[in-house]
């Protein structure tokens, strides 16, 4: 993983068993129609690679021309390859949409390593496995990148599903879900599953592969099992959440809980990993090492470098710890945790060893822009932003990866006091610098 | 300072088990620093790795011997041990013990090889 | 499988000359690599660890370089002691499994 750029993102797909589906809590909200319920079209309609990000269809223009886009909680564009590239069997042809609409404005998005750079335009969109809706959205004609797409991933743009503050280049472009739900009745909120395999796939098991879900406009109850916990989006640029303590196998990091949020957290899935601030990456580390140490790994591979290969079939989750993260609660003084396995942050990897062995990548990495929830994390969770009530929702997903022994949770309520101290306030001088960083 | 001394018969016969040991001395095989390996090599012909062993008994297999290899440790005495089974001509070889370090990556130390020929 | 493929498999040079051994990864290893020297009767011996760093008590006229796929090894002015086979090792995937076949360097 090339970890100073958010992408690519890691998914993996199928395979994996079921979570135990727990009987529904009775404290769960009243049904809000339109929200919640059975989304039958747009189930399943993910796909993805090992590391290379979750992608949907999509159409844009007319005719509509066909592109898959990854889907991205980290960014505010809606941007699509709009040029010849080596990577890319496809791109978008505005010449050829009649609807297209050139907004004679360029836009340049640098990464800290990579960039992308294109012309505005707007132009009718629509997602075929989503609602039966098309809008016009602005999208950004990818013409020149630098590290940005990806050989082999299968997708041609990136859809940022995060707010306008963010947007490039600034946060007078509409974002694409901000239109969605402007000029259509769809509710303002989408919820994710995604999927990873527990096991690498080759490009065609991708292709013929079920990667997750993006429901949008509503919940999908067969998406999950057990209650979903609502915790509140501090504000409204990523999607930033506040993180009150953290434990691994149950033991306390013990650090300031400001320290878990600086400069920030949020929720990303076009991240792959679990990125921790470099104080709290290190105590985790040491922790988890602690906790494994039957078995010794080399620094390279707790610096998410070198892999680690077992015997297929042998690797031995029981000596890696659960990790918990709590998070903030819809109510005053109330917490609830979000607790992942190793099968969600030891990543597999492909093509490298035999076919005698399972190998693995140390998901978990440092981060100098604050905490990211990537795929690590949402892997193990059905995960709902709720715009319109300003929360993100998790609840354990039936397709996250487990053994007989330990499964991913989301449990509470637990008394968690001052949990307004836990946020950090980033000066305003420093806000720019730091979104071209996204290390 | 440490060293490694392999030990064990020279000559083993065809479908038999192959057994060697390796003494540490200078150092304790119980350094948490260290992973402890056996590696071999036929006459003439390049190095391939067997397997490795840490003091708590966790052990890595070469994929390719998996079936027919154990590795196991001694703390008390300082030793660990190789043991190839069902072994033939192809198994013939210098077979080395070392110590994997520079943070479990490398073997930085070597013992310096016992020629074990597979013969009726 | 990553494989290692070092080249040439002899090198016939003189002392003093400088030599210089290369070691191609079927995919990248990163700098997970090391150089191993082994002459006849003796066991292999460390020579760099991590692509470029020498290890314990060798010489500096050996030097090593490269990441990703391609690595080489250096030997900037050839001692009578340093005509030996010598081995690249990656560690990328660990545990450290993989030797590549070994460059024989020869007294011309």
């Known amino acids: 993983t090339q970890h100073g750029i958010r992408l690519p993102l890691r998914s993996g797909l199928g395979g994996a068993p079921l979570g135990l589906r727990l009987p529904r809590e009775t404290d769960e909200e009243p049904e809000e129609p339109g929200r919640r319920g059975s989304f039958v079209e747009m189930v399943d309609n993910l796909r993805g690679k090992s590391g290379q990000g979750y992608y949907v269809e999509m159409t844009v223009g007319s005719p509509p021309q066909t592109l898959n886009i990854l889907v991205d909680t980290g960014s505010s564009n809606f941007a699509v390859g709009a040029a010849p590239h080596p990577f890319l069997h496809r791109y978008y042809q505005r010449q050829l949409s009649s609807t297209y609409r050139d907004l004679r404005k360029g836009v340049y998005v640098p990464y800290t390593q990579g960039k992308w750079e294109g012309e505005l335009g707007t132009d009718l969109v629509s997602i075929p496995h989503g609602p039966n809706v098309t809008v016009r959205a602005n999208i950004a004609a990818i013409t020149e990148s630098d590290k940005f797409f990806i050989n082999g991933s299968n997708w041609e743009g990136i859809l940022g599903l995060a707010y306008a503050e963010i947007a490039r280049p600034d946060d007078s472009l509409e974002p694409f879900f901000d239109s969605l739900v402007k000029q259509t009745h769809v509710p303002n909120l989408f919820s994710l599953q995604l999927c990873g395999a527990g096991f690498p796939l080759n490009q065609s098991e991708v292709l013929a592969s079920v990667g997750g879900s993006m429901i949008i406009g509503g919940i999908d109850h067969s998406l999950y099992t057990g209650s979903l916990w609502y915790t509140p989006i501090r504000r409204e640029w990523y999607y930033e959440v506040i993180i009150v303590r953290v434990e691994i196998n149950g033991q306390d990091l013990k650090m300031d809980c400001k320290e878990y949020n600086y400069d920030k957290s949020i929720v990303d899935s076009g991240t792959t990993n679990l990125r921790l601030p470099k104080k709290v990456f290190e105590a985790a580390v040491k922790s988890i090492k602690a906790a494994s140490s039957t078995e010794k790994f080399p620094d390279g591979f707790w610096l998410g470098e070198q892999l680690v290969c077992w015997q297929a079939g042998t690797t031995p989750w029981n000596i890696f710890p659960v990790i918990s993260l709590y998070l903030m609660g819809e109510v005053t003084n109330q917490s609830f945790r979000i607790t992942i396995l190793p099968q969600q942050y030891l990543r597999p990897v492909e093509d490298v060893a035999t076919s005698q062995d399972d190998c693995y990548k140390f998901a978990i990495s440092q981060s100098s822009t604050g905490t990211v929830m990537g795929a690590v994390i949402m892997e193990g969770f059905y995960v709902v932003f709720d715009r319109a009530r300003k929360r993100i929702g998790f609840a354990v997903s039936a397709c996250h990866v487990h053994d007989e022994f330990r499964t991913a949770a989301v449990e509470g309520p637990f008394v968690t006091l001052d949990m307004e101290d836990c946020g950090y306030n980033i000066p305003q001088t420093d806000e720019s610098t730091l979104m071209t960083g996204r290390a | 300072q440490l060293q490694l001394q392999e030990s064990g018969p020279g000559l083993v016969k065809p479908s038999e088990t192959l057994s060697l040991t390796c003494t540490v001395s200078?150092?304790?095989?119980?350094?948490?620093?260290?992973?402890w390996g056996w590696i071999r090599q036929p006459p003439g012909k390049g190095l391939e790795w067997i397997g490795n062993?840490?003091?708590?008994?966790?052990?890595y297999y070469n994929p390719s011997l998996r079936s027919r290899v154990t590795i196991s440790v001694d703390t008390s005495k300082n030793q660990f041990f190789l043991k190839l089974s069902s072994v033939t001509a192809a198994d013939t070889a210098v077979y080395y013990c070392?110590?994997?370090?520079?943070?479990?990556?490398?073997?930085?130390?070597w013992g310096r090889g016992t020629l074990v020929t597979v013969s009726s | 499988e990553i494989v290692l493929t070092q080249s040439p498999a002899t090198l016939s040079l003189s002392p003093g000359e400088r030599a210089t051994l290369s070691c191609r990864a079927s995919?990248?290893?990163?700098?997970?690599l090391a150089w191993f020297q082994q002459k006849p009767g003796q066991a292999p011996r460390l020579l760099i660890y991590?692509?470029?760093n020498r290890a314990t008590g060798i010489p500096a006229r050996f030097s090593g370089s490269g990441s990703g796929t391609d690595f080489t090894l250096t030997i900037s002015s050839l001692e009578p002691e340093d005509f030996a086979v010598y081995y690249c090792?990656?560690?990328?995937?660990?545990?450290?499994?993989?030797f590549g076949g070994g460059t024989k360097v020869e007294i011309k």
């Open positions: 200078g150092g304790s095989i119980s350094s948490s620093s260290y992973y």
């Open positions: 995919q990248s290893v990163s700098s997970y």
């Open positions: 090792q990656q560690v990328y995937v660990w545990p450290p499994r993989t």
């Open positions: 070392a110590r994997l370090g520079h943070g479990y990556n490398y073997f930085d130390l």
């Open positions: 991590d692509a470029s």
């Open positions: 062993i840490y003091y708590s008994g966790s052990t």
